[in-house]
């Protein structure tokens, strides 16, 4: 889970050691503060649970790449 | 192609415990999440808990806490499901179930373990 | 908890004749932002684990003849097997996969009149 140390920074120091399912996940944000230990994502799910995750593993990229095509908007 | 082989059947007296086991093969447990299910004879699908990646730990039903532990060996991508002080009302098929990456929704299950508790 | 509750418990069909069963969650399964229905429908034969028939309420599984239909968002669904075969008979169940606990229905029992 992000700790947020002072706020605003929040920071991840552990990352999920599982896959969560693409479908449960509604958004995410990068963590990239120089005042966190470590580059992370956090994923928020549709039950609005945060989850730290490693920006280097490829089911977090395909992640947020899933996310990213669900949130443009479709040309007219 | 995710396949699902469980344990068999087992004949168990009042107030002891089982364990039922669930081997995974064409993924990985780190891919997926392992959820129990139960169902006694005649009666409908009843979730007993499972693995959920969301809180990084196994979650139960409310119902079974304290009396069912799941666990799992990554090394062997088998899962375990323990539940003690057996009573008549726990004879039932076992069913282990799993969603992957893609799905969510249990899209894989295995053929069920019969638990008869009788004296 | 999300409380899922079929009706009805059990439905007796001609051959041929279509048979619907409808599935009522005590809370919203649908999750806005990507406009889908947590919700999918199991058909199980005596003596088997549960097949899953449809998911997302709507999709239908690779495989499962087009006789099965999913329909429904929110807090109400249905599946309808337009005409009823021989090897329909079952126990159908719908579950959601909105939150946990990941709750059933109590099933409903589909037979030839």
């Known amino acids: 889970q992000p700790d947020a140390i002072n706020a605003p920074v929040t920071c991840c120091y552990n990352f999920t050691n599982r896959k969560i399912s693409v479908q449960r996940l509604a958004s995410y944000r990068r963590i990239t503060s120089s005042k966190c230990p470590k580059e992370a994502v956090i994923f928020k799910t549709i039950v609005a649970k945060e989850i730290c995750a490693d920006p280097k593993q490829k089911w977090v990229q395909d992640s947020m790449d899933h996310l990213d095509k669900q949130t443009q908007t479709p040309k007219t | 192609q995710v396949q699902v082989v469980q344990s068999g059947a087992e004949v168990k007296n009042p107030g002891a415990s089982v364990k039922v086991s669930c081997k995974v093969s064409?993924?990985?447990?780190?891919?997926?999440?392992m959820h129990w299910v139960r169902q006694a004879p005649g009666k409908g699908l009843e979730w007993m808990g499972g693995?959920?990646?969301?809180?990084?730990?196994?979650i139960y039903a409310q119902k079974f806490q304290g009396r069912v532990t799941m666990t799992e060996d990554t090394s062997t991508d088998t899962v375990y499901m323990e539940l003690s002080s057996l009573r008549s009302e726990d004879t039932a098929v076992y069913y282990c179930?799993?969603?992957?990456?893609?799905?969510?929704?249990?899209?894989?299950w295995g053929q069920g373990t019969l638990v008869t508790v009788s004296s | 908890d999300i409380v899922m509750t079929q009706s009805p418990d059990s439905l007796a069909v001609s051959l041929g004749e279509r048979a619907t069963i409808t599935c009522k969650s005590s809370?919203?399964?649908?999750?806005?932002?990507?406009?889908?229905?947590?919700l999918v429908w199991y058909q199980q034969k005596s003596g088997q684990p549960p097949k899953l028939l449809i998911h997302?309420?709507?999709i239908r599984e690779s495989g499962v003849p087009d006789r099965f239909s999913g329909s429904g968002s929110g807090t109400d669904f249905t599946l309808t097997i337009s005409s009823l075969q021989a090897e329909d008979v079952a126990v159908y169940y719908c579950?959601?996969?909105?939150?946990?606990?990941?709750?059933f229905g109590q099933g409903t029992k589909v037979e030839i009149k």
């Open positions: 179930a799993t969603n992957d990456f893609w799905s969510g929704y249990f899209d894989y």
């Open positions: 064409g993924s990985t447990l780190t891919e997926l999440s």
């Open positions: 693995f959920d990646p969301e809180d990084g730990e196994t």
């Open positions: 809370q919203t399964v649908l999750y806005s932002s990507n406009n889908k229905n947590y």
């Open positions: 997302w309420a709507s």
């Open positions: 579950q959601q996969y909105y939150s946990s606990p990941w709750t």
